[in-house]
Every structure is written in C-alpha cells, then in structure tokens.
C-alpha cells in the first residue's frame, strides 16, 4: 500500500527532515508550511494548526519561501547617478545600477551602493581600457605617431594622418596638418569610440620621442581599474 501523505502540521519521523517548502517549528515540534515569496508568517503553527501567512506590505518583500514574522524593507530609492533596473515588489527588492557614464565603485549584494563618474582621458592620452559596470576607464599616453585631442572617457589614441606634404607635424594631442594636397589616412575615417560605461585613468610623462625607426605597431587591450592620476580628469 502507498504511504499516506502527511498534511502540515505533522510530527516528522525520528531522524528525518521536513519536506520541501516546510520548516521544523521548534516550539510546536512539528513540520509546518513555509510562506511563499511575497508573504510572511502572520501566525506561527501549533501542534494543531498550520502557519498563517499574509502578504507583504507596501515597500517590503520576501524573495524566498520563508517563515519570517515580518517582510524585509526594500532599499531606499535610487540616487540621481543610478537607474532602477528592478522595481520594489512584494517578491523582490529594488535594484539600482549606475547610469551610463558612471561605474559601480562600491557594490552590494545586488546592485550598487556607490556610483562614480567614469574617468575622462585628457588630450594627449587615450582610453587604454574601457570601463565596465564595475571598473573605471584606464588612460595611457598616446604613443609616438598617435594622438587624442579630446577630453573623453571613450576616445582612444589614433594614428596621425599621413601627409604628402606636412604643414604642421602632429603630436600627442594634435593630428598632423597637411598642406592643401589631400592627405591619406592611416585609418578609416571617423573617431573610434569605446562603449559606455567607461571612464579614464592615469597618464603621465610625455611619450618618449619618436624612435629613429618607426615602431612596428600592434595592440592589445587595456586593463583593470585604477585611481585617477595626472592624465585623467573628473567629470
């Protein structure tokens, strides 16, 4: 014969545990029902009556099956540098993430506790590591033969245009200026932008003078977050 299904509350067999979505009440010494997400225990179970659950009040929530006497309070409203990516409901807490152009400098279990503006690289420096949701941009000096003339958290150093006849040589913060004959670009037209979020980073010391032989050039990408330094500016 099939074993009888026990209905809560019931006394568990010695050495056994309560079933899924049940908990053991020490006072009643019975297996009792948990409350579903969005509810809390209004009245705990006894030997003869099961848990009585009630809905969470406004601005409170429970995310899991539970037997807590009160629902948890939702976090405070998102600050001006954040966006609400998950609203406070009876079943989930509010989640705030940093808005575009900012990154999370101090995270919490879900979402972000403190957002900071992405660093901006000043002219002569380019983004060497795009920012992410949790890391700042890194700036580095433009290498010989490249430049950046912007203060930006998204612009990388770009090669100088190649002139048939140079009117003004380029430097780290300015492109070469050609005489009226049309220049040939060493790159496709249009600025290269990094995706948001991004911010910028330290840059210091002038790049070393152009070596007598042009360097072969290659590139990889940048790296982890770091504090602002000379080459970067605040927002």
């Amino acid at each position: 014969l099939p074993a009888q299904v026990a209905f809560t509350p019931y006394a568990p067999e010695p050495g056994s545990t309560c079933r899924l979505r049940e908990y053991y009440d020490q006072t009643a010494q019975m297996c009792c029902s948990k409350c579903s997400p969005g509810q809390h225990a209004k009245v705990f179970c006894t030997k003869t009556s099961d848990t009585v659950c009630d809905s969470c009040e406004d601005s409170t929530y429970t995310q899991l099956w539970n037997w807590v006497p009160e629902c948890l309070s939702c976090g405070s409203r998102c600050s001006s540098d954040q966006v609400e990516t998950q609203a406070c409901t009876r079943e989930q807490n509010r989640i705030c993430t940093c808005r575009p152009g900012w990154y999370c400098a101090l995270s919490k279990q879900e979402g972000c506790r403190l957002c900071a503006p992405l660093r901006k690289c000043r002219p002569g420096f380019g983004v060497a590591r795009p920012g992410t949701e949790t890391s700042d941009v890194v700036c580095k000096p433009c290498a010989p033969g490249t430049f950046s003339n912007t203060t930006s958290s998204t612009d990388i150093c770009r090669p100088h245009q190649i002139c048939n006849v140079v009117a003004i040589p380029g430097n780290a913060s300015m492109d070469a200026v050609c005489t009226s004959t049309s220049p040939t670009r060493s790159m496709a037209p249009g600025a290269v932008h990094l995706p948001q979020p991004v911010s910028t980073r330290s840059q210091h010391t002038q790049p070393t003078p152009e070596p007598s032989t042009a360097p072969s050039t290659s590139f990889l990408l940048p790296m982890g977050p770091s504090p602002p330094a000379e080459g970067s500016t605040g927002d």
Epitope: V127, T132, V138, K140, A143, C157, T205, P215, F219, M223
Partner: antibody, heavy 118, light 109 residues
C-alpha cells in the same frame, strides 16, 4: 631606442615553476602595459595576460588565472611572468610585449624558450 | 573562454586581393571587440597591422585594411606583394582579456 630584453631559456620538470624576466629600456615603463604571450612549437599565439607597471593591476586569460603571476619592478624597469604547476603543454616561447590594442606602441622581446620535460 | 577562428591558410597571386577573416564563438564580432591584426614573418619580430577594427598602425602600407564583414573581423590585402607572405593573427577583446585566433598562413604565389 625601445628594447625589451628577456631572460634566457629554461628547462623545467613537470610540476615546477618558472619565472621569466623582461627588462624594458628606451621609454618610461609605466606609460604602457606589458603583455605576456606564448607560442608553442608549430602553434599560434596565446595571450596570457597583461600588467600595468604603473599600479601593478593585472588581467589574465581565463586559462591562466590560477597559474600565472605577472609583476613589475619599476625601479629596474623589469616585468616578470611566473608560471606554476608546469606541464609538458607549457613548452613554448614566451614573449613580453608592449603590444596593446589602443596604443600602437608595439615592441616585443626576443622570446624565452621554456621546455617542460621529465 | 571564447574561441577565435581564422582560415588556416590562404593563397593570393602577386598584385591580387585577399580577405582574411576572424570569427568569434560568442556571436558577431563588433567594434567592442577592438579587432587587432598582427603579422609574423619567419625569423622576424611580430608587427601589429590593424587596431580598433580598422585603424592602420603607423607605418603600415595602405594596401592593408581592416573592417567588419558579416559579423566577422576582416583584414583585406589589396595588391599583395611577395613580402606580405606571413602568418596573420587576429586578436579580439572580451571585456577583460584578449583571445588570439589560430592564425592564417598567407602564401603569395
């Protein structure tokens, strides 16, 4: 002129560690990342990771996260790569480089051959 | 870890045009992958040709160009020269690390 000079060839037993050095000259080492890349015999390039000499921040390829350690000594303008728990598949030429996707500051060391054999 | 795939080998006639491609296992290649192309000639140092998908590095001849084609990064060589015979590697950026492709052996024949 810019130069990256690496330490000499190494022969190691499986399970051992190796530390390769890369001395930079001709530029300010803190201005550009140092990358480590390897090439096994007859194989392509494999990116190991990158270190920022300015602050020591590192990023590693997922496959090397647990075994590789990159450091720099700015006082001597030297970068180091240490690889632990060596196995035969780690036999390769290891290169240090300033090759960095945004910088166009592209210099490579001469390579250090690491042989792992019992 | 993402896998980056290139054609193992390609052949081009002198003066001809050839396109090498670079595919990502995680989906279409975008400008956020900052595709780079690196050249390796036997017995010579590596040399970066293209960065940021389509920027030619200083000193790189105009016959090399980078682009995105059909969800892949592409390196096009127009007017191939015998000295362009080499191994070509692409590298793609994935948020906090680079991944190289297996390389394409280009023969100019």
């Amino acid at each position: 002129q810019v130069q990256l000079v690496q330490s000499g060839a190494e022969v190691k037993k499986p399970g051992a560690s190796v530390k390769v050095s890369c001395k930079a000259s001709g530029y300010t080492i803190t201005d550009f990342y140092i990358h480590w890349v390897r090439q096994a015999p007859g194989q392509g390039l494999e990116w190991i990771g990158r270190v920022d000499p300015e602050d020591g921040n590192t990023e590693y390829a997922p496959n090397f996260q647990d075994r590789a350690t990159m450091t720099t000594d700015t006082s001597t303008s030297t970068a180091y790569l240490e690889l632990s728990s060596l196995r035969s598949e780690d036999t390769a030429v290891y290169y240090c480089s300033t090759w960095d996707g945004f910088s166009y500051f592209d210099y490579w060391g001469q390579g250090t051959t690491v042989t792992v054999s019992s | 870890q993402a896998v980056v795939t290139q054609e193992p080998s390609l052949t081009v006639s002198p003066g001809g045009t050839v396109t090498l491609t670079c595919r990502s296992s995680t989906g279409p290649v975008t400008t956020n992958n900052y595709a780079n192309w690196v050249q390796q000639k036997p017995g010579q140092a590596f040399r970066g040709l293209i960065g940021g998908t389509n920027d030619r590095a200083p000193g790189v001849p105009a016959r090399f160009s980078g682009s995105l084609l059909g969800g892949k990064a592409a390196l096009t060589l127009s007017g191939a020269q015998p000295e362009d015979e080499a191994e070509y590697y692409c590298a793609l950026w994935y948020r906090n690390h680079w991944v190289f492709g297996g390389g394409t052996k280009l023969t100019v024949l």
